[in-house]
Interface confidence: low
């Protein structure tokens, strides 16, 4: 901060702001009676030059005219783009320990006078909004710079609306707060931008438009749409618009789509009819304007509109499977199951299944609803039973599908050959078969099942199948395949009253178990040792287990022990060996084998025989 | 975030006047949806009117056909307050009245169905005595 000028004063030729190149006299003179005190001769006046409140310069060379004692006139040049401060002061150099004294200072803006600003361009958004114009200022002035924008129209309409900028903001954008109504549709307008600073001023080119040129509609807003009797396909959509709209775009799609359905509609006056939507299907849907048909702009697209179209009728045929199981000797368990519809086949909520197990000759039918997609009756095993189900919803009932309860497995001639279960991948397998070799009747189809081989898988889950047709011998199963989990797959071959089917094991990744089996007991019967054990817990198996191993050795013994290898069965839990010697104590342990590898041993568990050796 | 705290309400006999305010703080701006809703008890919220106002200034209102011509919206966007003018009041009039702001979903009723916007007040009471 300068005193006020008390001492003197500083005077800048040819003025304060000066164009970038140009050179600069400053003059700093004292005022009368002021000085050093005594002796004015030795009044020495020195130009500090400051950049951002830092001292850059002391422009003593500088100086190009010189009244000792009363004034001197420094010239400076190169100053750079900005506002640079100059400070006199006062030097009295017969005291050398006093500092020099200020006496006035004079700040220098040097800049370029403004460019014509271009590209200017205007809009109004919507018939309501206001004229709002934005244009390019340019280079930088490094000025204070004022920007003019003038709108003229018919009638010697005329408007203006002022902004500057600065170092601290830019001006290259003006509301005018003129709204252009409908009726001056063909009327042209001019618009033109002026810029002025202490450099200099120009002006743009006039900017000619018309209403329909900057007009930018509204969105369509209060978008709505009425289903012609609750149809799910056809519905009229409906919106709001300003009242000089002549086009719309429509837009909509499924919620989980990736691409729109496109639709223009060319006076729609705020009404179009949609015939080819999906029942029971959350869609979206959104409405662009424009007043002209072949100029103008779109607006923006209006707000989303999500709804669900109504339910029709399901299409669907489901997919059913069941299993059997004998009770006792006239009575059979009956599980039937079903896949749920697609929802382009559903085409709505499914409420209820409607099943119906029917005895062909004796004309027997039980019938129920069910919400699940399985049902299981209990039913005599004499007789030809068929089984159908369909699917209800709002609108109504998809055709029922009917199934021939056959048995599944019993036809040994029917049963596929060669079934292979390969690991593709971390989630799939693929099965692959040969036909039956002597089938006597031609194969329908065949059913691909598989379910995981774990405890209660039977009860507590569902199967999962695939229908495969005769002419295919391979299958890739996938749905609820998980690694590192052993499933049971059966190939079903069925015929219109029979049923053949081969069964094996499968996984899609495996590892070495993590454990081996825990041997529970050792009993000797008749000469032979008896060992008894626990499966390994179905978690550990990691896959499918090939067979088990039995080693012994006898306790002390530094040779290999000595194996035997088992198929591995889930049923089994126990297997006889009988090449131990009597009155000699054994170790004896188990593994388990994958395809992946052997686990470590179980437990050790030590016997010694006491019948004869074989 | 944005705050809306509604204001104004009140008793009046029919016919009289109430003006409603509806200040917005936090993130605030002018190009949004606002609008006032009521309800009476046992009824569901109903939209009353509203107001658009785009990124250039220009806007749009809207009324529900029972309050057309009695009563009037508006917002002063430097108080970034919404106002609801009301003359010639009814009985039927007698409502909670709600202040909302920011249409970001559109349903089948357009600006009248209340789930469609993100921001609500807690409401202001009217009561209309004949």
């Known amino acids: 901060n300068i005193d006020v000028c008390k001492l003197g004063t500083v005077t800048v030729q040819p003025a304060p702001v000066i164009p970038l190149g140009s050179a600069a006299n400053i003059s700093c003179s004292l005022n009368p009676k002021q000085g050093c005190s005594h002796y004015p001769s030795s009044n020495e006046l020195i130009l500090l030059k400051f950049v951002n409140d830092v001292l850059v310069e002391n422009l003593h060379g500088k100086k190009v005219h010189d009244h000792t004692g009363h004034s001197s006139t420094f010239q400076v040049t190169n100053l750079s783009l900005g506002m640079t401060l100059f400070v006199c002061k006062l030097n009295c150099s017969n005291s050398q320990k006093k500092p020099p004294v200020p006496v006035c200072g004079v700040e220098i803006s040097v800049g370029v006078a403004p460019e014509p600003p271009q590209n200017i361009s205007c809009v109004q958004e919507g018939e309501n909004g206001t004229v709002a114009c934005s244009w390019n200022s340019g280079k930088v002035t490094y000025l204070k710079t004022n920007y003019t924008l003038q709108l003229s129209g018919p009638n010697n309409l005329t408007c203006q609306k002022q902004c500057f900028s600065d170092n601290r903001q830019n001006c290259n954008r003006l509301d005018l707060g003129i709204n252009l109504s409908p009726d001056l549709a063909e009327s042209r307008f001019i618009v033109r931008v002026t810029a002025i600073n202490d450099l200099g001023n120009s002006s743009s080119l006039p900017h000619t438009f018309t209403f329909l040129d900057i007009v930018i509609p509204l969105p369509p807003w209060d978008i709505r749409i009425n289903f012609l009797n609750a149809s799910g396909s056809r519905g009229t959509l409906q919106w709001e618009d300003e009242g000089q709209v002549v086009l719309n775009q429509l837009r909509y799609q499924p919620l989980n789509s990736t691409s729109w359905n496109m639709v223009n509609a060319t006076n729609a006056k705020g009404k179009y009819d949609l015939r080819d939507l999906r029942p029971f299907t959350e869609y979206e849907f959104q409405i662009s304007s424009k007043l002209h048909l072949s100029g103008g702009s779109w607006s923006n697209w209006s707000e989303s509109l999500r709804t669900r179209t109504p339910e029709e009728e399901p299409v669907g045929i489901l997919d059913i499977w069941y299993m059997k199981q004998d009770i006792d000797y006239d009575r059979q368990q009956i599980s039937l199951f079903w896949k749920s519809l697609n929802p382009s086949e559903a085409r709505g909520k499914i409420l209820h299944y409607q099943v119906t197990l029917q005895e062909v000759t004796k004309k027997t039918t039980l019938q129920n609803t069910t919400r699940h997609t399985s049902w299981t009756r209990v039913i005599p095993r004499t007789g030809a039973w068929t089984a159908s189900v369909s699917a209800a919803n709002s609108k109504g009932a998809s055709a029922p599908t009917h199934i021939n309860i056959v048995d599944l497995c019993g036809t040994g001639l029917l049963a596929p050959h060669q079934v292979s279960a390969k690991s593709e991948n971390m989630d799939n397998i693929l099965v692959t078969w040969q036909p039956p070799k002597k089938a006597d009747s031609a194969v329908r189809e065949y059913i691909v099942e598989w379910r995981a081989l774990q405890p209660g898988s039977i009860t507590k889950f569902p199967p999962h199948w695939l229908r495969i047709p005769p002419d295919n011998m391979s299958a890739l199963i996938s749905e609820n395949i998980k690694p590192y989990i052993c499933y049971e797959i059966r190939v079903h071959a069925l015929s219109e009253s029979q049923g053949g089917c081969s069964s094996i094991r499968g996984d899609s990744k495996h590892k070495a178990p993590v454990s081996g089996p825990h041997i529970t007991a050792i009993t000797e019967k008749k000469e032979r040792l008896f060992i008894s054990w626990t499966h390994i817990p179905f978690p550990e198996q990691r896959g499918c287990i090939l067979h088990y191993r039995i080693y012994w050795k006898e306790r002390d013994s530094t040779a290999q022990p000595e194996l035997c290898e088992i198929q591995y069965r889930r049923s089994q839990n126990s297997h006889p060996i009988s090449s131990l010697q009597p009155r000699v104590t054994y170790v004896l342990w188990m593994t388990a084998v994958t395809a992946a590898g052997e686990s470590p041993q179980g437990n050790e568990r030590e016997f010694c025989p006491q019948g004869k050796a074989n | 975030q944005v705050q809306l705290q509604e204001s104004g309400g009140g008793s009046v006999q029919a016919g009289g006047s109430l003006r409603l305010s509806c200040a917005a703080s936090?993130?605030?701006?002018?190009?949004?949806?606002m609008g006032w809703f009521r309800q009476a008890p046992g009824k569901e919220r109903e939209g009353v009117a509203a107001i658009y106002t785009g990124y250039t200034g220009g806007g749009n209102t809207y009324y529900a056909d029972s309050v057309r011509d009695r009563f009037t919206i508006s917002q002063d966007n430097a108080k970034n307050t919404l106002y609801l003018q009301m003359n010639s009041l009814t009985p039927e009039d007698t409502a909670m009245y709600y202040c909302?702001?920011?249409?970001?979903?559109?349903?089948?009723?357009?600006?009248?169905?209340?789930?469609?916007?993100?921001?609500w007040g807690q409401g202001t009471q009217v009561t209309v005595s004949s």
């Open positions: 909302a702001a920011d249409l970001t979903r559109w349903y089948s009723g357009g600006w009248r169905d209340p789930r469609g916007y993100k921001y």
């Open positions: 936090g993130a605030t701006n002018s190009n949004r949806h």
